[in-house]
């Protein structure tokens, strides 16, 4: 039975040209995290494997940095970066947990927000 929950930064905003840290946290489970995949809608941004470390997808290498921790830093933001981001936790023995973050990249200076929450499901 999957008892864990993913906490995320929820809905966040950042300025064009700036950077943002995407963070998720898995709690309420003793399952071992074997890998975390970071995805942007339909694209794979990066994989953090518990043993092997980080692999940043080649198309994002110039503006994605690993960390802090299991998080991901997006740099040189453009308005096209606005959208949904997902952290996918591969765990043993539970299976897969998914958290969602919505990023809005603003053209000019403006207020930012932080939220919480997330959801989880299991891939068979």
């Amino acid at each position: 039975m999957m008892t864990g929950t993913i906490e995320t930064t929820g809905q966040i905003s950042a300025e064009k040209g700036g950077s943002i840290i995407l963070q998720c946290h898995l709690s309420s489970t003793t399952a071992q995290v074997t890998q975390v995949n970071w995805e942007q809608q339909d694209q794979l941004l990066a994989i953090c494997n518990a043993d092997l470390g980080w692999h940043i997808s080649p198309s994002f290498k110039d503006r994605v940095a690993p960390g802090p921790g299991l998080g991901l830093t997006l740099q040189s933001l453009t308005v096209q970066d606005t959208g949904e981001y997902f952290c996918i936790y591969h765990t043993y023995p539970d299976g897969t947990y998914t958290g969602r973050i919505f990023l809005e990249v603003l053209e000019s200076s403006g207020g930012g927000g932080a939220g919480g929450g997330g959801h989880h499901h299991h891939h068979h």
Epitope: E39, Q43, L44
Partner: antibody, heavy 121, light 107 residues
Amino acid sequence: QVQLQESGPGLVKPSGTLSLTCAVSGYSITSGYSWHWVRQPPGKGLEWIGYVHYSGSTNYNPSLKSRVTISVDKSKNQFSLKLSSVTAADTAVYYCARMDYGNYGGAMDYWGQGTLVTVSS
Amino acid sequence: EIVMTQSPATLSVSPGERATLSCKASQDVRTAVAWYQQKPGQAPRLLIYSASYRYTGIPARFSGSGSGTEFTLTISSLQSEDFAVYYCQQYYSTQWTFGGGTKVEIK
């Protein structure tokens, strides 16, 4: 230039233990990367067996986990595979390979030439 | 376990022609796919990683494409040394799996 070379008995009896080593030249296996075993039954596709990371951690294919041990011999710059309780289904060409995860993800970029192991009495 | 299914099992092509090989994943693997070439009696050779990036020293006639569950390896103009078996592999999950292979033979 990194080179990998498998060695070990070409014939193992059923219920016995298959033991292979992979000698690595051109790179110290305790300096980086992960070091893998992959097998290929005659006329069939490839199956990942498991790896040892340079840090010493290991990870195995769940379907083989109960029978597999992969370890490193630092002094000889080689790593080994032990597969216990073998049956005819374990007859295959066994390859060792290197994975540069940071650059190429889970793709294996250097391979040994492979060694055929037959399980038969 | 993510199952990778390759088609066709055998592809007959004349030298100089284009070859298109297919690989389908049983679930979404984004772009975490590699392609290998294997000739008889030899080890696999890495061609493509991250679905579309050529490995060092691989000729430009080899190209990979796709995302999600459907992937393609294209050899634009087959040379005599390209007749071999080709395998796809996924590394989206922590248990890496390979396809069954496509044999490219001379027509």
